[in-house]
């Protein structure tokens, strides 16, 4: 039975040219995390594997910094970065947990962080 929950940074906004931290946290389970995938819609951004470290997708290579922790820092934001992002936690023995973040990249200087929320 999957008991865990994923907490994410929720709906967030940031300015064009700036950077943003995409962050998820898996709680309420003793399952071992073996890998975390970061995806934008159906496109892979990065993988963090417990044994092999980080792999960054070539299309994002120049503007992604792994971290903080299992999170991802996306730099040099463009309006094309607006959209849904997913953290996919591969765990044993529970299986897969997925969290969703919506990022809006704004032209203006009015960019505020949304509240945190949980996905069971």
């Amino acid at each position: 039975m999957m008991t865990g929950t994923i907490e994410t940074t929720g709906n967030i906004s940031a300015e064009k040219g700036g950077s943003i931290i995409l962050q998820c946290h898996l709680s309420s389970t003793t399952a071992q995390v073996t890998q975390v995938n970061w995806e934008q819609q159906d496109q892979l951004l990065a993988i963090c594997n417990a044994d092999l470290g980080w792999h960054i997708s070539p299309s994002f290579k120049d503007r992604v910094a792994p971290g903080p922790g299992l999170g991802l820092t996306l730099q040099s934001l463009t309006v094309n970065d607006t959209g849904e992002y997913f953290c996919i936690y591969h765990t044993y023995p529970d299986g897969t947990y997925t969290g969703r973040i919506f990022l809006e990249v704004l032209e203006s200087s009015v960019a505020e962080h949304g509240a945190r929320f949980q996905i069971p």
Epitope: N49, G53, W54, I56, K61, D62, R63, A65, P68
Partner: antibody, heavy 118, light 106 residues
Framework: QAYLQQSGAELVRSGASVKMSCKAS????????MHWVKQTPGQGLEWIGY????????TYSQKFKDKATLTADTSSSTAYMQISSLTSEDSAVYFC???????????WGQGTSVTVSS | QIVLTQSPEIMSASPGEKVTMTCSAS?????MHWYQQKSGTSPKRWIY???KLASGVPARFSGSGSGTSYSLTISSMEAEDSATYFC?????????FGAGTKLELK
């Protein structure tokens, strides 16, 4: 087994700069963040920043962004840190440390001692 | 930035005694990591992800906590446990360390 070998102690003049190295072995250098940490008796452990050698992207603590420059050479699996405009406040031991899964630093170099003389 | 406050700063314990030290965060973090450092040596990862023991760490050590309150416990103090212990978070930038708890043998 991962291993980090740092360069030797440095005695440098005030106002000069120093560049130290951290040679990694036993793992795929490009796949792990390399953090740099300053240790002084008065300030304990202070995070300077990190570099991801796979793409050279760096992140600095605000306190050190105009003081330290992090680089990495994947061909030799070596990370470097340059500290500029040295003052007595920069006298410390500097460690490189590999960023492990989840954000803990799982392997540390032996440290490079920097002494700034006036 | 997230400030980590360790207490006590210095403590001493007799062999066999239970030891608990704490690390309080100025805002909530998802995990805490702990390092052991002995004089003249590099820090060693000791406990990571709040409660996982690093390779080679004796089972008498344990870690626990959540939110803003975390602790490291030694069930039965031994001479080799004398060291300084630092907590560390990387929930967001900047990564921060606590000032350390120095544990001495009584």
């Amino acid at each position: 087994q991962a291993y980090l070998q740092q360069s030797g102690a440095e005695l440098v003049r005030s106002g000069a700069s120093v560049k130290m190295s951290c040679k990694a072995s036993g793992y795929t250098f490009s796949n792990y963040n390399m953090h740099w940490v300053k240790q002084t008796p008065g300030q304990g452990l202070e995070w300077i920043g990190y570099i991801f050698p796979g793409n050279g992207v760096t992140t600095y603590s605000q306190k050190f962004k105009d003081k330290a420059t992090l680089t990495a050479d994947t061909s030799s699996s070596t990370a470097y840190m340059q500290i500029s405009s040295l003052t007595s406040e920069d006298s410390a031991v500097y460690f490189c440390a590999r960023g492990g899964f989840g954000g803990a630093m799982d392997y540390w170099g032996q440290g490079t001692s920097v002494t700034v003389s006036s | 930035q997230i400030v980590l406050t360790q207490s006590p700063e210095i403590m001493s314990a007799s062999p066999g005694e239970k030891v608990t030290m704490t690390c309080s965060a100025s805002s909530s973090v998802s995990h805490m990591h702990w390092y052991q450092q002995k004089s003249g040596t590099s820090p060693k990862r000791w406990i990571y992800d709040t409660s996982k023991l690093a390779s080679g760490v004796p089972a008498r050590f344990s870690g626990s906590g959540s939110g803003t309150s975390y602790s490291l416990t030694i069930s039965s103090m031994e001479a080799e446990d004398s060291a300084t212990y630092f907590c560390q978070q990387w929930n967001n930038n900047p990564l921060t360390f606590g000032a350390g708890t120095k544990l001495e043998l009584k």
